[in-house]
């Protein structure tokens, strides 16, 4: 059973079969004798009741208003009324793109990760019994698939799979041939699964400083969007008015991960800032990674091996 048309605003392409199904349908079957009315209003036109004589293209059923096919002048507001129940739809019929097998404004976009399962199934449950055949096109070129009733693609995605896939259903009604097109814009992206976040550079950094001067300690990491990067220092963070955490900067990598950096600024360096650990940590659901900075007076730098020294 096809679900009812609950969305209040609908856009459709001219020249295709289309239907509106009201949302009290089960109720309508229980009350066969109840008067059911469909109305249309557009522009200055007040609510005009629709009937089979309104247009040869319009068919009225208990639950459904059908268009064979829908045309540009069908744009407007449609109402269904039965007993205590009233429903309204605003229908916008747009021009078909005559230079393509699909109309850009009627495309559903989907993002698929490379190597992940990718599926396109051409189905149309409402018109199923009337469909003669269905074709699947990629970028308007017909794909040769075994099943011409419900063509399907099922595979692990590759970058070459990116493109516009159009399911075109061909059906007959009252001796006329119609088609219904449903198009998907498939974008293939890099694997977006989480990485283990990592801090860049050595785990322990000795920084040569001069008393009374300022220093900026830069902590950089490669991480996931939801991961956090923070500084820990002293017994109570924030107890030293000369220490400031700057705003975190983030740049997205081409792979969809994040490069983050957070600077700890120490102003007017004093003795109390020397030889203590300033720890930078990146934390995620998968665990943490920490690197440490130690400020060392320049005069004492001869005592430190060169390979652990940063400026």
């Amino acid at each position: 059973a096809e679900s009812c048309t609950s969305r209040p605003h609908i856009t459709v392409v001219e020249g295709e079969p289309f239907y509106l199904k009201h949302c009290s349908c089960s109720l309508a079957h229980e009350i066969e004798t109840t008067t059911k009315s469909w109305y249309k209003s557009s522009g200055s036109q007040e609510h005009v009741e629709l009937n089979p004589r309104s247009s040869s293209r319009i068919a009225l059923h208990d639950c459904v208003l059908e268009f064979w096919p829908v045309e540009l002048n069908d744009t407007g507001s449609y109402f269904f009324q039965m007993k205590n129940y009233t429903q309204k739809w605003k229908l916008n019929v747009i021009r078909r793109n005559k230079h393509s097998c699909f109309t850009e404004r009627q495309v559903t976009s989907k993002i698929v990760e490379v190597k992940k399962f990718f599926q396109i199934t051409c189905e149309n449950s409402y018109y199923q019994t009337l469909v003669n055949s269905t074709s699947l096109y990629k970028n308007c070129k017909k794909l040769l698939l075994e099943n011409n009733k419900n063509p399907t693609i099922k595979k692990n995605a590759e970058f070459e799979d990116q493109g516009y896939y159009s399911c075109v259903h061909f059906l007959h009604h009252n001796g006329k041939l119609f088609n219904i097109t449903k198009t998907f814009n498939i974008t293939i992206v890099e694997d977006r699964s989480n990485i283990v976040p990592v801090l860049l550079g050595p785990k322990l950094n000795h920084v040569a400083v001069e008393l009374g001067k300022n220093v900026r300690l830069n902590c950089s990491a490669l991480l996931n969007e939801e991961d956090v990067i923070y500084w820990m220092f002293g017994e109570e963070n924030g107890s030293d008015p000369n220490i400031h955490e700057e705003k975190e900067m983030r740049i997205m990598t081409p792979e969809g991960k994040w490069h983050a950096s957070k600077v700890l600024r120490i102003e007017n360096i004093g003795e109390s800032n020397l030889n203590v650990l300033y720890n930078c940590t990146v934390a995620s659901t998968g665990g943490t990674d920490t690197k440490s900075f130690i400020l060392v007076r320049k005069a004492d730098m001869a005592d430190i091996p060169g390979h652990v020294f940063t400026r």
Partner: nanobody, 122 residues
Amino acid sequence: EVQLVESGGGLVQPGGSLRLSCAASGTAYDNACMGWFRQAPGKEREGVASIHLRDRTYYADSVKGRFTISRDNSKNTLYLQMNSLRAEDTAVYYCASSNICNALNLQGNTYWGQGTLVTVSS
């Protein structure tokens, strides 16, 4: 932008009358139905009256015969005429508009106003 703006609330004595207005933008006004709802302190919001396409009207049992819902299409405005007011009518009154309506139940994409306070007290 869809907007519903109520006005006309205030303090009134028991037995008195008030007329609430709801000015609506086009999309909200030309809907399947519009209605008045109310919420008394500590209670759930309840339907008071609704008017459907072709001016079909529905009322809560507690207001039948006392309240009248109407609209003026030239002004895109919904009204609620409240007569013989009682203390139990005290509430914030909301105007609403929906694309799916079943008597007083709004079941679809529903727009709400900010509400206007009606106090019935001596």
